[in-house]
């Protein structure tokens, strides 16, 4: 079965600044990713960015950089300023989708006891659906 | 402008084939998804078939599976759909649409649909 | 494959109502749409993505909800809003549509 892993990450030098690592554990050809945060988009969260392998990618505010790392794997970084800036129990979501095949997604925050700059190996977090 | 106008249908008897077309312009058509959508005379929606991948990928549920084939020609900017032994259930206005993948592969554009009849 | 049943089938109401019909799933869906079919025309995409309101469409119209349970919302019901409106999924194909609500204006 198909998984999908989130790593969240709070950056040493600035400690409102955030990197989201997403990765597709499975085979298929991803076609479009989805970054969101307070939750799965259209249950109260909010899409960071959308990214597509060969149309680009689309990102909003906090959202500072987006990028593919490989065929099946992104970051994001996130902008720790102003009112719309994440806090240490922010939830961040990362769908995958093949289209018409179905898609899959998981949710991570930052690991409670973190130390800014350090981050584990990525695991993969629970898997909330996988249609 | 986008513009997706469907040919080809008609009057068939059981048993009979048909090929539907579906010329498209004002976007990259080889960069989309596209599908057919069937509206049956209860104006039911059902979907028929899908084409993404540029033509590689075709998927199609089980009630038309082995009867239906569907096909692109990316450089004439047209989509086809084959039906061979139609039956009197697959009468329905028949449309096309696109995928727009940055959203989420919704059915942005439709055509004005074509209407096959399947009667003796 | 995922069946989504439309309630009500059809509803009636007046100009400036806040309306609302439902869409629910047979199991959790990862992306719904809701369009609108007007007589002697093609349907037109409203949300995607659930609660993303297409190009064009007006603010008036609003969607919600997640797993199995989702909402289209008109807030303040207008003339041209008298249509039937479509639920579809797609998790895993085949893509599934709602048989619909129609709409008509009291």
């Known amino acids: 079965t198909p998984e999908v892993w989130v790593q969240v990450r709070m950056e040493a030098t600035e400690l409102s600044s955030f990197t989201i690592r997403c990765g597709f554990l499975g085979s298929g050809s991803i076609s479009l990713v989805t970054v969101s945060w307070g939750g799965p988009n259209g249950a109260g969260g909010t899409t960071l960015a959308v990214l597509h392998p060969e149309r680009g990618i689309r990102q909003w505010a906090p959202a500072r950089q987006a990028r593919w790392e490989t065929q099946s794997s992104i970051s994001l970084i996130l902008e720790g300023s102003g009112a719309s800036s994440p806090c240490a129990n922010t939830t961040f979501c990362c769908k995958f989708a093949s289209f018409p095949e179905g898609s899959w997604e998981a949710c991570g925050s930052l690991p409670p006891s973190s130390d800014p700059g350090l981050s584990a190996p990525p695991t993969p977090a629970p898997i909330l659906r996988a249609d | 402008e986008v513009q997706l106008v469907e040919s080809g249908g008609g009057l068939v008897k059981p048993g009979g084939s048909l090929k539907l077309s579906c010329a498209a312009s004002?976007?990259?058509?080889?960069?989309?998804?596209m599908s057919w959508v069937r509206q049956t005379p209860a104006m039911r929606l059902e979907s028929v078939a899908t084409?993404?991948?540029?033509?590689?990928?075709?998927y199609y549920p089980d009630t038309v599976k082995g009867r239906f084939t569907v096909s692109r020609d990316n450089a004439k900017n047209t989509l086809y759909l084959q039906m061979s032994s139609l039956r009197s259930e697959d009468t329905a206005i028949y449309y096309c649409?696109?995928?727009?993948?940055?959203?989420?592969?919704?059915?942005?554009?439709w055509g004005q649909g074509t209407s096959v009849t399947v009667s003796s | 494959q995922i069946v989504l049943t439309q309630s009500p089938a059809i509803m009636s109401a007046s100009p400036g109502e806040k309306v609302t019909m439902t869409c629910s799933a047979s199991?959790?869906?990862?992306?719904m749409f809701w369009y609108q079919q007007k007589p002697g025309s093609s349907p037109r995409l409203l949300i995607y993505?659930?609660?993303n309101l297409a190009s064009g469409v007006p603010v008036r119209f609003s969607g919600s909800g997640s797993g199995t349970s989702y909402s289209l919302t008109i807030s303040r019901l207008e003339a041209e809003d008298a249509a039937t409106y479509y639920c579809?999924?797609?998790?895993?194909?085949?893509?599934?549509f709602g048989a619909g609500t129609k709409l008509d204006l009291k």
């Open positions: 199991s959790s869906v990862s992306y």
């Open positions: 004002g976007f990259t058509f080889s960069n989309f998804a």
């Open positions: 084409i993404v991948n540029g033509g590689i990928n075709t």
């Open positions: 579809q999924q797609w998790t895993s194909y085949p893509l599934t």
């Open positions: 649409a696109r995928h727009d993948d940055f959203l989420y592969y919704a059915m942005d554009y």
């Open positions: 993505d659930t609660s």
